[in-house]
């Protein structure tokens, strides 16, 4: 089936926005006013995955770019990266596992768990201007809760 996608931005629970930091990295920082235009717009695609009544599998691409968030092992550690793909073949309903995140909604907040590495989540640091990363802890110092803002196509 054709993949269903929507455009959105994400902010962490401390209201930090996500922006590009170089060609293959995202960072989180507080933005205001016109600077809000810097924040990345995601194309969130609803894909096949280990769906449950609580978890919805999604892929997170950068709108109008052939880049997707993916989870891979680097130096034996689950790592978040931006991966370049062939735009002729993506997005698709059947994404490879490394591209899939389980979107979990709890108390109007969203978590994004890696399908490839269960219990590892898209995370931001408390500190400003730090990379978005894959973290293996919830409820600690690092932030794993996000809100989503819809963006019209």
């Amino acid at each position: 089936a054709p993949v269903r996608s929507l455009n959105c931005t994400l902010r962490d629970s401390q209201q930090k926005s996500l922006v590009m930091s170089g060609p293959y990295e995202l960072k989180a920082l507080h933005l205001q006013g016109q600077d809000m235009e810097q924040q990345v717009v995601f194309s969130m695609s609803f894909v096949q995955g280990e769906e449950s009544n609580d978890k919805i599998p999604v892929a997170l691409g950068l709108k109008e770019k052939n880049l997707y968030l993916s989870c891979v092992l680097k130096d034996d550690k689950p790592t978040l990266q931006l991966e370049s793909v062939d735009p002729k073949n993506y997005p698709k309903k059947k994404m490879e596992k490394r591209f899939v995140f389980n979107k979990i909604e709890i108390n109007n907040k969203l978590e994004f768990e890696s399908a490839q590495f269960p219990n590892w989540y898209i995370s931001t640091s408390q500190a400003e201007n730090m990379p978005v990363f894959l973290g293996g802890t919830k409820g600690g110092q690092d932030i794993t809760d996000f809100t989503m803002q819809f963006v019209s196509s």
Epitope: A1, P2, Q48, G49, E50, E51, S52, N53, D54, K55, K93, K94, M95, E96, K97, P118
Partner: antibody, heavy 122, light 107 residues
């Protein structure tokens, strides 16, 4: 060789809880999901729900409020519990292995147990 | 939920006949459709996955085709052991849904 075997009481009283066990061999429950499917006598197949390798579950909406699927990886067993049963829950209950082929056939079911008939009657 | 319309619900045929069963889905499921054979008192057996891929060990007289919303299952030359009930299953999205079944009987 992949095998699945359902077991449990063949007769359950109305309003009670139906409990079934699916014992598997030839694959690991930590790697593959298992679905439950039922078939009322003389009728078609209805997908009930499943449990994934990681333990997450998806329950079909009509049964969601009455259904619990759980598993014990070390015993290679998946269990189904359906509460507050009525005569409409009389069926042959099957468990089946998910193919779990990412980016190809994640949701398909390949191997099935032989099924067990559960009758709901007082 | 994706609705499945399988037809015919029953079919009489003779050994050697070519038999076709169709399955129509309420929305586009690409090729995410399986076909199963069930004999009385037995569990369903997978014959075809992903619309057209023959399951290992299944005779080549069985075939499947189609994509999107329209699918066809064919037995090219009926054998005595093929008299059974056949079901389609969509594996595109949850909840998984089956067709109503086609009972294939001896004419």
């Amino acid at each position: 060789e992949v095998q699945l075997q359902e077991s449990g009481p063949g007769l359950v009283k109305p309003s009670e809880t139906l409990s079934l066990t699916c014992t598997v061999s030839g694959f690991s429950l930590s790697e593959f999901g298992v679905s439950w499917i039922r078939q009322p006598p003389g009728k078609g197949l209805e997908w009930i729900g499943l449990i994934w390798g990681g333990g997450d579950t998806y329950y079909n909406s009509p049964l969601k409020s009455r259904l619990t699927i759980s598993k014990d990886n070390s015993k290679s067993q998946v269990s189904l519990k359906l509460s507050s049963v009525t005569a409409a829950d009389t069926a042959v209950y099957y468990c089946a292995k998910q193919r779990n082929l990412w980016a190809y056939d994640l949701y398909g079911m390949d191997y099935w147990g032989q099924g067990t008939l559960v009758t709901v009657s007082s | 939920d994706i609705q499945m319309t399988q037809s015919p619900s029953s079919l009489s045929a003779s050994v050697g006949d070519r038999v076709t069963i169709t399955c129509q889905t309420s929305q586009d499921i690409d090729m995410d459709l399986n076909w199963y054979q069930q004999k009385p008192g037995k569990a369903p057996k997978l014959l075809i996955s992903q619309g057209s891929t023959l399951w290992p060990g299944v005779p080549s007289r069985f075939s499947g085709s189609g994509s999107g919303t329209d699918f066809t299952f064919t037995i090219s030359s009926l054998q005595p052991e093929d008299f059974a009930t056949y079901y389609c299953l969509q594996t595109d999205s949850f909840p998984l849904t089956f067709g109503q079944g086609t009972k294939l009987e001896i004419k």
